[in-house]
């Protein structure tokens, strides 16, 4: 009669939790039985992020640190079931913690928008397009950002209009701009739960142009056309 290792009740174990669960929350559990009826002790292996602990007797798994979906999901650890007494034989399975995203990343500009310019003087109102993003996971649909000017005083000179869920157009309201840099603040709201807002700045230079680029005296860099 050969002593057999414990047998897990499932091939693998999975649990879905919101990434913002409180520390100490039960996030899942594993179960195994020993063919000889011996008691089983559970342990975790490979908890590289130090997020979890297991109750050695019940197999219940708890969070011991803040979880972060952006660190990678599902988070996979090994669970070990070991006979108590006898030959101390053990079996290994896997516990996968699926982290459901909460809205915890404010919107930001999708790329570096330095170097935006208009040729001065403007012959007609001008516009440029910019893109927003965030670091949250958007299940089943892309992000749906809304855009507005960051302060009321900007509304005399600028307007912002949404193109789609990620892109918007910044337009001048008139042509009477000085030959200098204007910093336009844009408010981007992600419409999430809870909604998060980011205020970003688009630096726009009005400058004399030579062959389609901003002319700068020696020692200054040329700006390149982005619109």
């Amino acid at each position: 009669d050969v002593n057999e290792a414990p047998q897990f009740s499932q091939h693998v174990f999975q649990a879905k939790v919101s990434e913002d669960v409180a520390i100490g929350t039960k996030v899942g559990n594993v179960t195994a039985k020993d063919p000889e009826g011996l008691d089983i002790s559970y342990s975790l292996r490979g908890d590289t992020r130090g997020w979890l602990k297991i109750d050695h007797v019940t197999g219940e798994i708890f969070s011991v640190a803040p979880l972060d979906r952006e660190a990678g999901s599902p988070y996979r650890v090994q669970v070990v079931a070991t006979e108590v007494g006898g030959s101390s034989l053990s079996s290994v399975s896997e516990f996968h913690l699926i982290l459901m995203d909460v809205n915890d990343n404010p919107p930001r500009l999708a790329k570096d928008y330095t170097g935006l310019f208009f040729c001065h003087p403007l012959s007609a109102p001008g516009s440029l397009i910019f893109e927003a993003t965030d670091d949250d996971q958007h299940l089943f649909r892309g992000p749906h950002f809304t855009f507005s000017l960051g302060s009321g005083s900007l509304q005399n000179d600028w307007e912002v209009s949404k193109i789609n869920g990620t892109h918007a157009r910044l337009s001048t309201r008139h042509t009477e701009f000085e030959e200098r840099e204007y910093v336009v603040l844009i408010r981007i709201n992600d419409g999430g739960r809870p909604p998060l807002e980011g205020i970003v700045s688009l630096p726009v230079t009005f400058c004399s142009c030579v062959e389609g680029s901003c002319f700068r005296p020696a020692g200054h860099k040329h700006h390149h056309h982005h619109h």
Epitope: S9, Q10, H11, V12, Q14, K16, G46, P74, R76, V92, E94, H96, I98
Partner: antibody, heavy 116, light 107 residues
């Protein structure tokens, strides 16, 4: 990036054995179980079994217990499946696949033809 | 063994349409279910795991739903590149088993 490389084809005679390989790259080979599947033309996938390369623990579908033997060589990050006592029923495409929740990466498959 | 009953066996739809494939299991598998797309001459690709979670890089027009013994895969706004065979598979306990597949064609 993660890759599982399998030879495109194997030819064997009835009654013989064949050992097919699955070379893993782009991840820690020992950290993920490797599964094997069989697919015959016009039929669904059948799960053969898996090996845990870090412990060499194997588990088989009862249907393939006397047909397939799974092994792994950590030094070359390669998983192997040997099929014995081949018959025409063993002619199929065999896939290796890395285990996560489901199989997140698959090899291209090895087409085994058993013919005299 | 857990039996996976997938339907329909084949379906044809137009670009832009929404299609749904269903998978019924012979016992409760508690959302331990994956969906795969298998294109001719390629390896299968994981679309959904844990019944509802989209795998990395999968277009947002794919979605999974269900629990207990009833599961479905929905493809919104069908594209020509979605032509493939689709499989459900449980990983609740061994032996792991697959559905018989649904062949999706474009009208």
């Amino acid at each position: 990036q993660v890759q599982l490389q399998q030879p495109g084809a194997e030819l064997a005679k009835p009654g013989a054995s064949v050992k097919m390989s699955c070379k893993a790259s782009g991840y820690s080979f020992s950290s993920y179980w490797m599964h094997w599947m069989k697919q015959r033309p016009g039929q669904g996938q059948e799960w053969i079994g898996y090996i845990n390369p870090s412990t060499d623990y194997t588990e088989y579908n009862q249907k393939f217990k006397d047909k397939a033997t799974l092994t792994a060589d950590k030094s070359s990050s390669t998983a192997y499946m040997q099929l014995s006592s081949l018959t025409s029923e063993d002619s199929a495409v065999y896939y290796c696949a890395r285990s996560r929740l489901g199989f997140d990466y698959w090899g291209q498959g090895t087409t085994l033809t058993v013919s005299s | 063994d857990i039996v996976m009953t997938q339907s329909p066996a084949s379906l044809s739809a137009s670009v832009g349409e929404t299609v749904t494939i269903t998978c019924r299991t012979s016992e409760n598998i508690d959302s331990y279910l994956a969906w795969y797309q298998h294109k001719e001459g390629k390896s299968p690709q994981l679309l959904v795991y844990a019944a509802t979670v989209l795998a990395d890089g999968v277009p947002l027009r794919f979605s999974g739903s269900g629990s207990g013994t009833q599961y479905s895969l929905k493809i919104n706004s069908l594209q020509s590149e979605d032509v493939a065979r689709y499989y459900c598979q449980h990983y609740y306990r061994t032996p792991l088993t697959f559905g018989s597949g649904t062949k999706l064609e474009i009208k």
